[in-house]
């Protein structure tokens, strides 16, 4: 699979990881996590052109299959290959507790 | 997250596991796989409107941001949440070998 | 560059209590949150709690609930620590650590060594 | 609580070899886990997070890997200012638990 850098459709328009800064509010998280107030959301975002950042078989299989077939079968998509965990400060019934979540934040991402 | 069954945008519109017939030409295959002639693709197809089968807390960040800003942040993705092994019989330097594939056909979906 | 700067040590009577500082500089102090680890001689360390240094939220190991009391003050960038009805056990070096959502304790001070003794 | 343990307290090295420092979880922390080194008298260098993730500023000489309960340090290369004491921490869930430690000294 070709890496993050040599995208068919320019710069930066393939399958990577991408930052977006979200309020509480915009997460719908606001009644039960108190800190922090913003969150640097990372998520996988881009196109999957043919073999790019392909995660395995069925990627492959998805790609050939696209071509023939568009109306069909959707093109890979690009999705989070590992996550970050992330650690909140939060409302419990008791007081306030430290709780990590592991599959919040995208580490890095391929097609599929 | 809803089931399979309760697709908000009608019936068998939503992410699920569709069956896709292929012939070993239209996979590219048809230079190194002998058998099977025909493959039965298994693969994550359908919408995923919010909350469907979501399959973590991304996921639901997906939702929620592309809520927000839908020109900037995807929709979530249909995409499998497991694997079926496949056995091919395929041609070697040597001659003729079986092998599993742990990554090729889809066996449940999520979204992602 | 990021400091956290704390008095090398403090001397207290059993039973009394004590108020330790971590001044942090060479970052915005409220953009992160502030840990205090304790470790005694020839141990492990040991995580006290963590304080959210803009809205003041605390959350504490079990452990430390009721000795333990974390505080900012935001003007100074300045966190505390208060240790109350010290006993020897209370002896040991206490670190203060800067920590985020994902990057955890990032940057530590040097610690303050803290000696319980009549 | 989760305990970490790291079993060996003490491991021998010479310089410009590959050393493994070993971290096991008392459940499944997924992939929270920091390292930290210390060296006497000094305060704790963070070196990972998330695992595998080096710290800016960090040499790439030393690799976090590992998920759910096993975890490893690997210092390739090892320079004499490498000797010093290694901890691991979960942070995967309240109260953070560190691991006993391992001091890197010389054979």
């Known amino acids: 699979a070709r890496n993050g850098d040599d995208c068919p459709l320019g710069p930066g328009r393939c399958c990577r990881l991408h930052t977006v800064r979200a309020s509480l509010e915009d997460l719908g998280w606001a009644d039960w996590v108190l800190s922090p107030r913003e969150v640097q959301v990372t998520m996988c975002i881009g196109a999957c052109p043919s073999q790019f950042r392909a995660a395995n078989m069925h990627a492959q299989i998805k790609t050939s299959l696209h071509r023939l077939k568009p109306d069909t079968v959707p093109a890979p998509c690009c999705v989070p290959a590992s996550y970050n965990p992330m650690v909140l400060i939060q409302k419990t019934d008791t007081g306030v507790s430290l709780q990590t979540y592991d599959d919040l934040l995208a580490k890095d991402c391929h097609c599929i | 997250a809803r089931n399979g069954d309760d697709c908000p945008l009608g019936p068998g519109r939503c992410c699920r596991l569709h069956t896709v017939r292929a012939s070993l030409e239209d996979l590219g295959w048809a230079d190194w796989v002998l058998s099977p002639r025909e493959v039965q693709v298994t693969m994550c197809i359908g919408a995923c409107p919010s909350q469907f089968r979501a399959a973590n807390m991304h996921a639901q960040i997906k939702t929620s941001l592309h809520r927000l800003k839908p020109d900037t942040v995807p929709a979530p993705c249909c995409v499998p949440a497991s694997y079926n092994p496949m056995v091919l019989i395929q041609k070697t330097d040597t001659g003729v070998s079986l092998q599993t594939y742990d990554d090729l056909l889809a066996k449940d979906c999520h979204c992602i | 560059q990021v400091q956290l700067q704390q008095p090398g040590a403090e001397l207290v009577m059993p039973g009394a209590s004590v108020k330790m500082s971590c001044k942090a500089s060479?970052?915005?102090?409220?953009?992160?949150?502030m840990h205090w680890v304790k470790q005694r001689p020839g141990q492990g360390l040991e995580w006290i709690g963590v304080?959210?240094?803009?809205?003041?939220?605390?959350s504490y190991n079990q452990k430390f609930k009721g000795k333990a009391t974390l505080t900012v003050d935001e003007s100074s960038s300045t966190a505390y620590m208060q240790l109350s009805s010290l006993t020897s056990e209370d002896s040991a070096v206490y670190f203060c650590a800067r920590g985020g959502t994902t990057v955890v304790l990032d940057y530590w001070g040097q610690g303050t060594t803290l000696t319980v003794s009549s | 609580d989760i305990v970490m343990t790291q079993s060996q307290k003490f491991m021998s090295t010479s310089v410009g070899d590959r050393v493994s420092v070993t971290c096991k979880a008392s459940?499944?922390?997924?992939?929270?886990v920091a390292w930290y080194q210390k060296k006497p008298g000094q305060s704790p260098k963070a070196l990972i997070y998330?695992?595998?993730t080096r710290y800016t500023g960090v040499p790439d000489r030393f690799t976090g890997s590992g998920s759910g309960t096993d975890f490893t340090l690997t210092i390739s290369n090892v320079q004499s200012e490498d000797l010093a004491e290694y901890f691991c921490q979960q942070y995967s869930s309240s109260p953070w638990t560190f691991g006993g430690g391992t001091k890197l000294e010389l054979k």
């Open positions: 060479g970052y915005t102090f409220t953009d992160y949150w």
């Open positions: 459940q499944n922390v997924g992939t929270a």
């Open positions: 304080i959210d240094t803009s809205e003041s939220y605390t």
């Open positions: 998330s695992a595998s």
